[in-house]
């Protein structure tokens, strides 16, 4: 799986979308988990409604929400009041029994609030020449990691 980068601004909401084949994952509940280290387990953050037919209902765990459009085949995760500690590698998953299929690997990057002048020197603004896979609402920008890029810094 390629990793898709979603960037959001600190203090604002970030919306992550995970498209999937609705028939391939028919009847499957979905989950959003956070990768603990490069080879570590993926720790469940939130999952869709226990009744698959009610997957469209938004479920919250703290500041993270999940909702599933099972007909259209799009899982949407909202990270509200994005904080620097939310940055990291995540997965959208399709669940069956004890098994979990990865739908998308997601790297969440948190940008400084442009209105917070203390961090003005650290801001990154996307230039017009840069291309992205998708532009999402709620201040999210996504792109795929370039070949050779790694989602985790090398450990010594």
């Amino acid at each position: 799986h390629n990793t898709t980068v979603f960037q959001g601004v600190a203090g604002q909401s970030l919306q992550v979308s995970c498209p999937y084949d609705s028939m391939k994952h028919w009847g499957r509940r979905k989950a959003w988990c956070r990768q603990l280290g490069e080879k570590g387990p993926c720790q469940r953050v939130v999952s869709t409604h226990n009744l698959w037919l009610l997957s469209f209902l938004r479920r919250w765990n703290g500041s993270t929400a999940i909702t599933d459009d099972t007909l259209g085949g799009t899982l949407t995760i909202t990270l509200r009041n994005l904080q620097p500690h939310d940055a990291g590698l995540y997965q959208c998953q399709s669940l069956h029994g004890s098994e979990a299929d990865t739908l998308r690997k997601v790297l969440v990057e948190v940008l400084a609030d442009p209105l917070d002048h203390r961090d003005a020197g650290d801001l990154w603004f996307p230039g017009e020449s840069e291309s992205f896979e998708d532009a999402h609402v709620e201040h999210s920008i996504s792109r795929s990691l370039l070949e050779g890029e790694i989602p985790f810094p090398p450990t010594s």
């Epitope: 084949d21 028939m23 391939k24 994952h25 028919w26 009847g27 499957r28 009744l51 698959w52 037919l53 069956h96 029994g97 004890s98 098994e99």
Partner: antibody
Framework: EVQLVQSGAEVKKPGESLMISCKGS????????IGWVRQMPGKGLEWMGI????????RYSPSFQGQVTISADKSISTAYLQWSSLKASDTAMYFC??????????????WGQGTLVTVSS | EIVMTQSPATLSVSPGERATLSCRAS??????LAWFQQKPGQAPRLLIY???TRATGIPARFSVSGSGTEFTLTISSLQSEDFAVYYC?????????FGPGTKVDIK
């Protein structure tokens, strides 16, 4: 009417290659997983692996990983099971089956008639 | 992988009697269990899926109880067409695994 029609019986020699087929009709072939199941003479059923013809996502049971290749051609609604070098122990009946997913559980709801493969020198 | 065991290996029953077949998993399979019937020279036929849901066209005399690791298939009144081999299959964990089967024959 949903149907899975398998290719005919095969008699082969050890070391030969073989590909058997399973043609689906009466439903959207690309929207359901197709599984392969082995039944050795006088024995029970063994799960070999499964393929989703929509994107050719394939999963193998560890016992069969590297022993067989599962593939599909969605343009002709056909799944395949292939051996590059047959052994006498591959002698068995091979079934394909459609996996239907649903809110009450998964089901291998339609089966092919089976293909008997005999490997003998 | 999960090991499925079925008992008894063979069950001899008279037509009209009740048959009780057991399937046990080495660890919980939740409700991700199916039952199949196979007659000589035929492909298996789906009877039950999701632990207790009868497949289309399966008569009400077939029922399943249990969840987790212990399941029981009951045929309330055996008909002549019910004499066959019965397999359970778990697909809670990869790889899915079948039980060795229970042969139901005429007493």
């Amino acid at each position: 009417e949903v149907q899975l029609v398998q290719s005919g019986a095969e008699v082969k020699k050890p070391g030969e290659s073989l590909m058997i087929s399973c043609k689906g009709s009466g439903y959207s072939f690309t929207s359901y997983w197709i599984g392969w199941v082995r039944q050795m003479p006088g024995k029970g059923l063994e799960w070999m692996g499964i393929i989703y013809p929509g994107d050719s996502d394939t999963r193998y049971s560890p016992s069969f990983q590297g022993q067989v290749t599962i593939s599909a051609d969605k343009s002709i609604s056909t799944a395949y099971l292939q051996w590059s070098s047959l052994k006498a122990s591959d002698t068995a009946m091979y079934f394909c089956a459609r996996r239907r997913q649903g809110i009450w559980g998964d089901a291998l709801d339609f089966w092919g008639q089976g293909t008997l493969v005999t490997v003998s020198s | 992988e999960i090991v499925m065991t079925q008992s008894p290996a063979t069950l001899s029953v008279s037509p009209g009697e009740r048959a009780t077949l057991s399937c046990r998993a080495s660890q919980s399979v939740s409700s991700n269990l199916a039952w199949f019937q196979q007659k000589p020279g035929q492909a298996p036929r789906l009877l039950i899926y999701g632990a207790s849901t009868r497949a289309t066209g399966i008569p009400a005399r077939f029922s399943v109880s249990g969840s987790g690791t212990e399941f029981t298939l009951t045929i309330s009144s055996l008909q002549s067409e019910d004499f066959a081999v019965y397999y359970c299959l778990q697909d809670n964990n990869w790889p899915p695994t079948f039980g060795p089967g229970t042969k139901v024959d005429i007493k």
